[in-house]
């Protein structure tokens, strides 16, 4: 063991260093002192530290540690925050365009329905946005409401335009008849299935990203314990008390200290890994009817088909409704909340077919790939922090918390620590309450993600198969899949040109009932490049 270097006879170096931490020199001894009051930097001989200096070192050490932790998570935090914002905006843009497509379909095909249809469509898509952002709306209620509202207008304007306007009674009768007679066939049920699946997944995806931000924020702002503060002080600052200003802590010693300080944080590791893998599974399954972009942008087509279905059956319906609603004042307005359980033809499943250029889907996959590079983030934190703070390479001529050593020995260091405080005890204390809370939240979202993940976890897939089609089973001929049987249906290539091209000159956003929607922003085009291929109702 080398002899300790001669102590600084005047504590001059210590004084000048300490002054950078704390202006004023009243706490620094001018010459080495016995240091019998010290509690952390226990001296083997005379020392240039006082109790007050030790306290200041502890505070500084904990602050340093917090800054190191924040810089360690900065890239990850930015990645999730940025993507959460981009996806939320992207989803809002998709909803807005889905609304515009649907309004354009009404404008082009059923102009006599437009004023009211615009209102009902606007309300429906407002509900879609609220649902995605976490509001407690039942999707079946949303879809039922859309068709409940549309049918009286379709009947009085398209099927029976001679009816007097005064007939509020008939409107109420028609709302009931809509369900009793299943006037739209199985289309409402089809839309419920598609919309609920795609929106549920979208909502959980956003929830998961927001929880990711919360996890990082929680660990980012952890307050380290006094025990940890003492360990850090001993590692980073106690050497100064002996005038060893240029000595760096041993790497192995740093790892031991960091593992002690981060024992609680590292417990997140298992759930964090599971979070990223579950999110990946969810994202892998977000296609066809589990992809809101696909579903919502194809909705105009399914609604169009549902109206055509009503028109095809107009003769029969008019007769039946004529009898049913002839004396609507006398009619008991009662309608069962019906389960639509008709067989659905595969050809009816009209989901807009998206060519995978730079779609939201590829953006999601890109995010997952980046997140996977952070899968070991929490288990690697102690090592990361040591590698980003000054430590001696190869553990030679370094500080082990008590003295300068030629080579670091973990066993010797542990023995030396025992009389000061128990490192093992620090580890055994368990995570901070905030860490426990965030672990519980991670467990919960992981459970949700597992439940939602496709295809095995999807309870609803089974129901789809029983109804006679698989989710988005379109075959090779994309025209089997796409909507667009009526007039005014054309294809628009390049979907995020779709954001640029989608007729901002189309006046549907100014339609009654839609005034609350945000106006398209110029930066939409740059938000996520080029979404893919969609079939548009625009002429």
């Amino acid at each position: 063991q080398p002899p300790p270097p001669p102590p600084d006879a005047t504590c001059h170096q210590v004084r000048s260093f300490f002054q950078r931490l704390q202006p004023g020199l009243k706490w620094v001894p001018e010459t080495p002192v016995p240091g019998s009051d010290l509690q952390v930097c226990l001296p083997k001989g005379p020392t240039c530290c006082s109790r007050k200096m030790e306290e200041k070192y502890q505070l500084t050490a904990r602050l340093n540690m917090e800054q190191l932790l924040q810089s360690a998570s900065m890239e990850l935090k930015f990645l999730i925050i940025q993507n959460a914002a981009v996806f939320q905006e992207a989803f809002e843009i998709v909803v807005r365009h889905a609304k515009n497509y649907t309004n354009a379909m009404f404008k082009n095909n059923y102009p006599s329905l437009t004023p009211q249809a615009f209102e009902f469509v606007g309300e429906f898509f407002t509900d879609v946005s609220l649902y995605i952002l976490g509001s407690d709306i039942n999707v079946d209620d949303m879809v039922n409401e859309l068709f409940d509202s549309l049918f009286p207008v379709i009947y009085t304007q398209l099927m029976n335009p001679g009816l007097p306007d005064s007939a509020l009674d008939i409107n109420e009768c028609l709302r009931g008849a809509r369900r009793d007679l299943k006037v739209f066939g199985n289309f409402p049920k089809l839309i419920m299935t598609q919309v609920s699946k795609s929106l549920q997944v979208t909502r959980i995806f956003l929830q998961a990203l927001n929880l990711g931000i919360e996890v990082i924020n929680t660990t980012d702002h952890l307050k380290f314990s006094k025990d940890c503060g003492r360990m850090l002080t001993r590692m980073w600052y106690c050497s100064y008390c002996q005038g060893l200003m240029m000595v760096k802590p041993c790497g192995g010693y740093c790892n031991v200290v960091m593992q002690g300080c981060m024992a609680g944080v590292v417990e997140i590791d298992k759930y964090w890994r599971e979070y990223i893998l579950s999110l990946e599974e969810l994202v892998n399954g977000m296609y066809r009817i589990y992809d809101m972009e696909n579903v919502l942008l194809g909705l105009f087509s399914t609604i169009h088909d549902s109206i055509q279905y009503v028109q095809k059956n107009a003769g029969k319906l008019t007769t039946t409704i004529g009898k049913l609603c002839a004396h609507s004042q006398q009619r008991q307005y009662r309608s069962a909340y019906y389960p639509e359980d008709l067989f659905i033809d595969k050809k009816v499943l009209k989901v807009a077919h998206v060519e995978h250029e730079e779609t939201l889907s590829s953006r999601r996959r890109e995010l997952i790939q980046k997140l996977k590079s952070f899968i070991s983030f929490y288990s690697a934190l102690p090592g990361y922090i040591c590698s980003h703070s000054p430590v001696a390479e190869n553990d030679t001529l370094c500080w082990n918390g008590q003295e300068l050593v030629e080579r670091y020995s973990q066993k010797a260091a542990r023995n030396g620590m025992k009389n000061q405080f128990n490192l093992h005890e620090l580890k055994m204390k368990g995570p901070e309450p905030v860490v426990s809370q965030i672990i519980d939240k991670l467990k919960h979202i992981n459970q949700l993600l597992r439940t939602m993940s496709m295809p095995k976890g999807r309870v609803l897939d089974k129901n789809l198969d029983e109804e006679g089609f698989e989710s988005g089973d379109c075959g090779d001929d994309e025209d089997e899949c796409i909507g667009g049987s009526g007039d005014g249906m054309i294809k628009v290539k390049n979907q995020l040109r779709f954001l640029a091209e989608l007729a901002y000159d189309l006046d549907v956003d100014d339609a009654p009932g839609n005034s609350q929607q945000a106006t398209p922003k110029d930066n939409e085009i740059s938000t996520f490049h080029n979404l893919g291929n969609v079939h548009s109702p625009l002429k």
Epitope: E119, G122, E123, T126, D127, S129, L130, L133, G134, S135, D136, I137, N138, D140, D141, M142, N144, E145, D148, D169, E172, C173, R175, G176, R179, Y333, R334, S335, A336, Y337, P512, G513, S515, Q516, Q517
Partner: antibody, heavy 121, light 110 residues
Framework: QVQLQESGGGLVQPGRSLRLSCAAS????????MNWVRQAPGKGLEWVSA????????YYADSVKGRFTISRDNSKNTLYLQMNSLRAEDTAVYYC??????????????WGQGTLVTVSS | QSALTQPPSASGSPGQSVTISCTGT?????????VSWYQQYPGKAPKLLIY???NRPSGVPDRFSGSKSGTSASLAITGLQAEDGADYYC??????????FGGGTKVTVL
């Protein structure tokens, strides 16, 4: 004639329970969300609770959450409000209100005449 | 949930115009959510005047109009008439779909 008729109000002691009913007629009850709104004497309107058309979604004001329960029977065209652990500050005229929409509370286009609930010892 | 903010009173002479403001937050009036307006006479149930920010139910005179901008909404009554003297309430809902009313504005026709 679209109508809502509340019943079940009255004088009740603090801590006790009361159940309000609202009978609906003249419209397709099962296709609209329904609400309870109250108005304390000389005060403004305060929304209490809402229920979606299917009854699947229910919503409550913070002031009544955990004490009041809204429900509906679509086969009877009736809306209910079960009020437990009543307090003096629950004293008000309780209105039943039909919503314009079905999925959640939005705008109330038909109102009952109200039933007075007085909580006092 | 906190109430929307309305002025307690407003007044005007017959034939004049009155505008009532209603201020909320980004999570209610300022969100995706719609604003409605009601008229209430003493001892009577409220009556819907405006829904969806600016739409009038049938039977409501076109003297009543509504608008919304950012986190504020307003009700305008033009050509004020004696029967317009009443309490007026704005209403919206927050992101949890809980309804929130304004405190009410008493309109006096001078």
């Amino acid at each position: 004639q679209v109508q809502l008729q509340e019943s079940g109000g009255g004088l009740v002691q603090p801590g006790r329970s009361l159940r309000l009913s609202c009978a609906a007629s003249g419209f397709t009850f099962s296709t609209y969300a329904m609400n309870w709104v109250r108005q304390a004497p000389g005060k403004g309107l305060e929304w209490v609770s809402a229920i979606s058309m299917s009854g699947e979604s229910t919503y409550y004001a913070d002031s009544v959450k955990g004490r009041f329960t809204i429900s509906r029977d679509n086969s009877k065209n009736t809306l209910y409000l079960q009020m437990n652990s009543l307090r003096a500050e629950d004293t008000a005229v309780y209105y039943c209100a039909k919503d314009r929409r079905g999925s959640h509370a939005d705008a109330f286009d038909v109102w009952g005449q109200g039933t007075l609930v007085t909580v006092s010892s | 949930q906190s109430a929307l903010t309305q002025p307690p009173s407003a007044s005007g002479s017959p034939g004049q115009s009155v505008t009532i403001s209603c201020t909320g937050t980004s999570s209610d009036v300022g969100g995706y959510n719609y604003v409605s307006w009601y008229q209430q006479y003493p001892g009577k149930a409220p009556k819907l005047l405006i829904y969806g920010n600016s739409n009038r139910p049938s039977g409501v005179p076109d003297r009543f109009s509504g608008s919304k901008s950012g986190t504020s909404a307003s009700l305008a009554i033009t050509g004020l008439q004696a029967e317009d003297g009443a309490d007026y309430y704005c209403q919206s809902y927050d992101s949890s779909l809980r309804v929130v009313f304004g405190g009410g504005t008493k309109v006096t026709v001078l």
